[in-house]
């Protein structure tokens, strides 16, 4: 999950495996101030999971979340 520094969440590692799409309710991008670009998925249990925006499954999930 993202690490908060001065209220700016940043990610230092990414989840490798795809999360179940049905478990994800929203997402956000971390700040450009962070050293690693990341997408943070928020699960239906309100857990935050860092993901690599370059991964295919991450892009696919973002697209589907944008459409829903």
């Amino acid at each position: 999950s993202p690490y908060s520094s001065d209220t700016t969440p940043c990610c230092f590692a990414y989840i490798a495996r795809p999360l179940p799409r049905a478990h994800i309710k929203e997402y956000f991008y971390t700040s450009g101030k962070c050293s690693n670009p990341a997408v943070v998925f928020v699960t239906r249990k309100n857990r935050q999971v860092c993901a690599n925006p370059e991964k295919k499954w991450v892009r696919e999930y973002i697209n589907s979340l944008e459409m829903s």
């Epitope: 990414y14 999360l19 799409r21 049905a22 699960t43 239906r44 249990k45 499954w57």
Partner: antibody, heavy 119, light 108 residues
């Protein structure tokens, strides 16, 4: 060294249940996703379901929904797969498998447990 | 649900190149993983994320993914490469891992 060691072969009668265990060593069970895959004699691999540690949930393949239960005992680093209402078509080798570190697929596998369903 | 189609068998002479295909609708939009399974043994991951190799897997194993077909290529085939090979993807529509039917590689 990551290792997954499964319980021994089982012979069951139709209608019975079977519970297969998978003991992990070399890492902590709740850090990674444990999945179960089966292979009927002479057939291909079939995913049954798995644990999602990030959300504390287990997901099951639709085909097995309601008939399979996957659990984990983190105190002993052992995962379990229980399949109920067994039929002859459930005769197969059952594998536990897990991802590990930065690899998004099933990097480590148990040796397999043969389950035979016969009257 | 998502369907992966593999040829049942591929034959190749030692030292030659084996190509194993895995077909699926717009499969290039998915990450494909490949497993090798020898008789009586558990599967072994040989390629993940289309073309990456886990440590310990020889460079002779490589993968590609374009259009509706992903391919596992085994260069300079050896007798020890004789096995069944399975492709796998994550289907986000069903939240299921999906395997192809498998391809038996025979080294002549």
């Amino acid at each position: 060294q990551v290792q997954l060691v499964q319980s021994g072969a089982e012979v069951k009668k139709p209608g019975a249940s079977v519970k297969v265990s998978c003991k992990v060593s070399g890492y902590t069970l709740n850090d990674f996703a444990m999945h179960w895959v089966r292979q009927a004699p002479g057939k291909g691999l079939e995913w049954m379901g798995g644990y999602v540690p990030e959300d504390g949930d287990t997901i099951y393949a639709q085909k097995f929904q309601g008939r399979v239960t996957m659990t984990e005992d983190t105190s002993t680093d052992t995962a379990y797969m229980e399949l109920s209402s067994l039929r002859s078509e459930d005769t197969a080798v059952y594998y536990c498998a897990t991802d590990y570190l930065y690899i998004p697929s099933l990097s480590y596998w148990g040796q397999g447990t043969t389950v035979t369903v016969s009257s | 649900s998502y369907v992966l189609t593999q040829p049942p068998s591929v034959s190749v002479a030692p030292g030659q190149t084996a190509r194993i295909t895995c077909g699926g609708n717009n499969i290039e939009s998915k990450s494909v993983h490949w497993y090798q399974q020898k008789p009586g043994q558990a599967p072994v991951l040989v390629v993940y994320d289309d073309s990456d190799r886990p440590s310990g897997i020889p460079e002779r194993f490589s993968g590609s993914n374009s259009g509706n077909t992903a391919t596992l290529t085994i260069s300079r085939v050896e007798a020890g490469d004789e096995a069944d090979y399975y492709c796998q993807v994550w289907d986000s529509n069903t939240d299921h891992w999906v395997f192809g039917g498998g391809t038996k590689v025979t080294v002549l």
